[in-house]
């Protein structure tokens, strides 16, 4: 009598008792060993002699033991063991070769849920098609941004498939990119074809400057045309200064003679002279440098009648050397609010910054910082680290300058200084930050989030949590629960809904008793381990009329995994045609008891299930 194959497999979860049970079933011929199980027990794959074959716990191996594993050894492991290995490699920060990464990715047969737990660079080798849908792809490509794309050569198939998928994920139509798009693409921005360079030069050229490899022909031609065109951000070559040349360093090889001829020759000479003096300028890996103030003219006395008595519109017409000679730094500092009301060229702003730097070498006072305006964009993170910003008004004023753009390193440093100065993320600060940067909260580590007082949670809007991962929601959910505890049922649910990705099973069960009618989008964000123990009746109550949406999501987690845990009879009561439940008459052994018995967490993930015919005894007797 042929019995269905046992599923899923034990992996590292087998206790001696369960192992004996399995052995008994195998010997009776009632459970066929599946391919992956055979691989683990050495029945089909080559014997595994290496360290990965049978350690009590992969996470107990040292980085040295993990470092040199060969692909052949990985191919003998189950998917769960491979995932466990990948997580251990990430935790121990083991640097892997391209071959090892490719091999690991190949063995992770289905898209991993816990992207944050995997080695960053491993994601480059996963197929982006496996992360379809706005949420999944956003999570995937947010992580890819931080990976080292240059592990893959430009022509590598894995790299070539990433860019189109990323563009689709971020909703880019045509060739026009925003600054946010370029930032979201990370290293993949270096692969954008020439048409993007042509249409989005203002935001893309500064990114291409720091691309490690040479640009391809198509990109070079587009960059050359854009630079020759003289549009933002660099302006016409005839107006370039030494600081422009500094900023353009990575693109200098693409310039071509027509552009070089139109740059003022004095500038080219000054730049060459400095480049030859300073060997660091010849290092190709140095990324884009902030334009620095350069004294390109001799210090000259201020012409008579030009000495600035106040900061007014007449300064618009001052040349750089005149600003340097005729504007007193103390006057500038006391009238910073006026500076903000007058348009200066970026070159003039360089001079003004230089004057303030000389006046305040230890860092600017807050009275000056609050009125920096566009001058803030000239500051480096190093400048900002010298500041002591305590007023929320100052913070707002500077965030306003950067409004509409992604968070720059300057803004990140400013926020960091401000929050550290306050000691915690209070409600007003959080309100302000999320108003300017809805994703701010999700850019914090779980450790940083732990300093958020529950009272601040009232300031959080659902969109502020869009990019949070499960680890962050695990920290935020208990705080939200505490913050909203005195609200009544329906109001409570409205507030807690966006935090539920961190909710445990018992809270979901409690919610199912309150007619909350959770929508599918929220349900899909719940923790898989929290959803699995829910009964069909509980899920039906939890979703209310939205339960019909389960059909459309039956192939996706957590719905897919939940279906596998339910009796088919129970699923049928929903009338949705959900398939994949446990057939009638099957016995379910929940091996998660292993954790309680051995004290070692089961590495397979939540509640592995082994299905065997309940008629076992009857058949034996027969």
């Amino acid at each position: 009598m042929a019995l269905p194959t046992a599923r899923p497999l034990l992996g590292s979860c087998g206790t001696p008792a369960l192992g004996s049970l399995l052995f008994l079933l195998f010997s009776l011929g009632w459970v066929q060993p599946s391919r992956t199980l055979a691989g683990e027990t050495g029945q089909e794959a080559a014997p595994l002699d290496g360290v990965l074959a049978n350690p009590p716990n992969i996470s107990s191996l040292s980085p040295r033991q993990l470092l040199g594993f060969p692909c052949a050894e990985v191919s003998g492991l189950s998917t769960e063991r491979v995932r466990e290995l990948a997580v251990a490699l990430a935790q121990k920060n083991v640097k892997l070769s391209t071959e090892q990464l490719r091999c690991l990715a190949h063995r992770l047969s289905e898209p991993p849920e816990d992207l944050d737990a995997l080695p960053l660079d491993l994601l480059l080798f996963l197929n982006p098609d496996a992360f379809s849908g706005p949420q999944a792809c956003t999570r995937f490509f947010s992580r890819i941004t931080k990976a080292n794309v240059d592990l893959l050569p430009r022509g590598a198939p894995e790299r070539q498939r990433l860019l189109p998928a990323a563009l689709a994920c971020w909703g880019v139509r045509g060739s026009l990119l925003s600054e946010a798009d370029v930032r979201a693409l990370g290293g993949l921005a270096c692969d954008l074809p020439g048409r993007f360079v042509a249409e989005s030069a203002e935001v893309l050229l500064p990114r291409l400057v720091s691309c490690p490899g040479p640009l391809d022909q198509d990109q070079q031609e587009a960059a050359r045309a854009a630079l020759q065109g003289g549009g933002p951000p660099y302006g016409p070559p005839s107006t370039w200064s030494v600081s422009t040349m500094d900023a353009l360093r990575g693109l200098l090889p693409v310039l071509g003679q027509p552009i070089i001829r139109s740059i003022p020759q004095g500038i080219v000479a000054a730049w060459r002279q400095r480049s030859s003096r300073d060997p660091s300028w010849r290092q190709p890996e140095r990324t884009i440098l902030r334009p620095r103030f350069r004294r390109e003219v001799e210090k000259t006395a201020c012409p008579s009648g030009k000495k600035a008595r106040e900061i007014d519109e007449s300064l618009i017409f001052y040349k750089k050397w005149e600003l340097e000679a005729c504007v007193d730094a103390a006057l500038l500092a006391t009238q910073m609010d006026r500076v903000n009301a007058i348009p200066f060229t970026y070159e003039q702003l360089d001079v003004l910054k230089h004057k303030l730097d000389e006046l305040y070498p230890q860092g600017y006072p807050e009275s000056v910082i609050q009125h920096l305006g566009y001058l803030f964009l000239k500051m480096s993170p190093e400048d900002i680290r010298k500041w002591n910003v305590t007023s929320l008004e100052t913070l707002k004023a500077l965030l306003e300058v950067n409004k509409g753009h992604e968070m720059s390193p300057q803004v990140a440093t400013l926020i960091d200084r401000f929050v550290k100065g306050r000691g915690q993320l209070d409600k007003d600060t959080l309100d302000t930050l999320t108003a300017f940067y809805p994703g701010y909260l999700c850019s914090l580590s779980p450790e940083e989030l732990s300093s958020v007082p529950p009272s601040s949670i009232w300031a959080v809007r659902p969109q502020d949590l869009d990019t949070c991962d499960p680890r962050q929601l695990d920290v935020l959910y208990p705080k939200a629960r505490l913050a909203f505890q005195n609200m009544n049922g329906s109001e409570y649910f409205v507030k807690i809904q966006s935090f539920l990705g961190g909710a445990p099973t018992e809270d979901l069960k409690a919610l199912s008793q309150q007619n909350v009618s959770m929508d599918l989008a929220t349900f899909m964000k719940l923790r898989t381990d929290a959803v699995l123990p829910l009964t069909v009746a509980e899920v039906q109550k939890l979703l209310g009329p939205h339960v019909e949406g389960l059909k459309a999501e039956e192939r996706h987690r957590p719905v897919r995994d939940w279906i596998l845990r339910q009796r088919q009879d129970d699923l049928d009561t929903l009338g949705l045609g959900l398939q994949g439940g446990i057939p009638n008459g099957y016995l379910v052994l929940d091996l998660s008891m292993q954790e309680a018995l051995s004290g070692t967490p089961c590495l397979l993930g939540p509640g592995p299930v082994l299905t065997v015919l309940a008629l076992l005894l009857a058949s034996t007797l027969a």
């Epitope: 933002p232 519109e313 618009i316 017409f317 500076v339 903000n340 009301a341 007058i342 348009p343 200066f344 060229t345 970026y346 702003l349 305006g373 566009y374 001058l375 964009l377 300058v401």
Partner: nanobody
């Protein structure tokens, strides 16, 4: 995307006149300042004339005061620079620009003006 395009440049005898035009397109209404700048070969770019769109108040560099006039036609999204009594030292590439409080943000490609004596 914001675009600025100058026209009207050319060669003229000293004492002559020219009218430069700048066509602006894209989302330019939010920019409070419009202006004309010039750059002669090997020289730094210098401001010539600017207009504050909040009250149409105009400002000029000392070297062109009384000879040049800046104006705008809001309906047509145009900025003009009327140049009279031109001198050889006015020869340069003239560019229009628009900006916020605090900084000039967008620049045109420039149009060449040559004044011969």
């Amino acid at each position: 995307q914001v675009k600025l395009e100058e026209s009207g440049g050319g060669s003229v005898q000293a004492g002559g006149s020219l009218r430069l035009s700048c066509t602006t397109s894209g989302y330019t209404n939010s920019y409070k300042w419009m202006g004309w700048f010039r750059q002669a070969p090997g020289q730094e770019r210098e401001g010539v004339a600017v207009i504050y769109t909040g009250n149409d108040r105009t400002y000029y560099s000392d070297s062109v005061k009384g000879r040049f006039t800046i104006s705008r036609d809001n309906a047509k999204n145009m900025i003009y620079l009327d140049m009279t009594r031109l001198r050889p030292e006015d020869s340069a590439v003239y560019e229009c620009a628009i900006g916020h409080d605090g900084a000039w943000r967008y620049w045109g490609q420039g149009t060449q003006v040559t004044v011969s004596s």
